[in-house]
Amino acid sequence: PQIFNKSNDGFTTTRSYGTVSQIFGSSSPSPNGFITTRSYGTVCPKDWEFYQARCFFLSTSESSWNESRDFCKGKGSTLAIVNTPEKLKFLQDITDAEKYFIGLIYHREEKRWRWINNSVFNGNVTNQNQNFNCATIGLTKTFDAASCDISYRRICEKNAK
């Protein structure tokens, strides 16, 4: 299935991305809890992953979607808005064989999926079910519908400093 816009560009058949089965540690943090680099705009907090001026946090603990949203908010971030193929592929590179909540929810009254910034998602969400109003990534190469009340890991996202 196409994840973003319908096309024949072969987006879902990429060269070599897939589940990352092993977790590798990040650089050693500095004492203030930030991984500092020499380049402007590349500072992410300890245990966050940097890519293209954004910081991403992949939790190891699990919680419901609402709790995940509040967790990210408490860290000055939001659940990840995975609105480009590039961002999705990066996250697929750094997620292991687990499901992670992202900032995508189904609006029943509109019958459409929206990102938490309110932008519409026109792509494909697999595993749709009457009771599945939230979405995860990580176990498959697609966005999967999931129950908002079941506990999964979460991906938070914010601007690098």
Partner: antibody
Framework: QVQLLQSGAELVKPGASVKISCKAS????????IHWVKQKPEQGLEWIGY????????KYNEKFKDKATLTADKSSSIAYMQLNSLTSEDSAVYFC???????????WGQGTTLTVSS | DIVMSQSPSSLAVSAGETVTMSCKSS????????????LAWYQQKPGQSPKLLIY???TRESGVPDRFTGSGSGTDFTLTISSVRAEDLAVYYC????????FGGGTKLEIK
């Protein structure tokens, strides 16, 4: 097949502005960012910035943020770069290219030669 | 910004020889969790647009001869061309795609 077709060579006077186009075909335009690269004669490549037509995200090399303005027309799959307050330093070949995380989409336009001269 | 430095700026070799060129970045381009270095090599022949040779520091682009080999990790990278041919006359650029995008200054390969 994926193609990026750029507009033709431009000869403009100092102080003027110019708008270069890049017509994309062979893939879904909104799925991949369009980048712009400058190459002065006999010199290296400089990244100017990119526009992501899907979500409207635009980022510039700090050096070009007051020089270049990037736009895109989703309906026609055309990306544009406007260069303003032109000087002889802006004389160069300008390339558009698309880019994808895993380099499946790494195609370049043929280049547009800009000459700034009175 | 990340600064990319290439050396040498030019070199001349005879056909059949092996050549190596260096690219250094001002900060690490490795994401250890993704196991990827966000570094690519491009070849630009005279009068042409650049062409992708190597991505993720060491993965050869489809259709690129195996004479071209990328290596290195973190901040130090190398492009090696074995059994150089006349058609390899070009400028070779490295580019980082980890924090926005930056090209190195290029290495011009000339054939004696």
């Amino acid at each position: 097949q994926v193609q990026l077709l750029q507009s033709g060579a431009e000869l403009v006077k100092p102080g003027a502005s110019v708008k270069i186009s890049c017509k994309a075909s062979g893939y879904t335009f909104t799925d991949h960012a369009i980048h712009w690269v400058k190459q002065k004669p006999e010199q290296g490549l400089e990244w100017i910035g990119y526009i992501s037509p899907g979500d409207g995200d635009i980022k510039y090399n700090e050096k070009f943020k007051d020089k270049a303005t990037l736009t895109a027309d989703k309906s026609s799959s055309i990306a544009y770069m406007q260069l303003n307050s032109l000087t002889s330093e802006d004389s160069a070949v300008y390339f558009c290219k698309n880019f994808d995380y895993d380099f499946i989409f790494d195609f370049w336009g043929q280049g547009t030669t800009l000459t700034v001269s009175s | 910004d990340i600064v990319m430095s290439q050396s040498p700026s030019s070199l001349a070799v005879s056909a059949g020889e092996t050549v190596t060129m260096s690219c250094k970045s001002s900060q690490s381009l490795l994401n250890s969790r993704a196991r990827k270095n966000y570094l690519a090599w491009y070849q630009q022949k005279p009068g042409q647009s650049p062409k992708l040779l190597i991505y993720w520091a060491s993965t050869r682009e489809s259709g690129v001869p195996d004479r071209f080999t990328g290596s290195g990790s973190g901040t130090d990278f190398t492009l090696t061309i074995s059994s150089v041919r006349a058609e390899d006359l070009a400028v070779y650029y490295c580019k980082q795609s980890y924090n926005l995008y930056t090209f190195g200054g290029g290495t011009k390969l000339e054939i004696k």
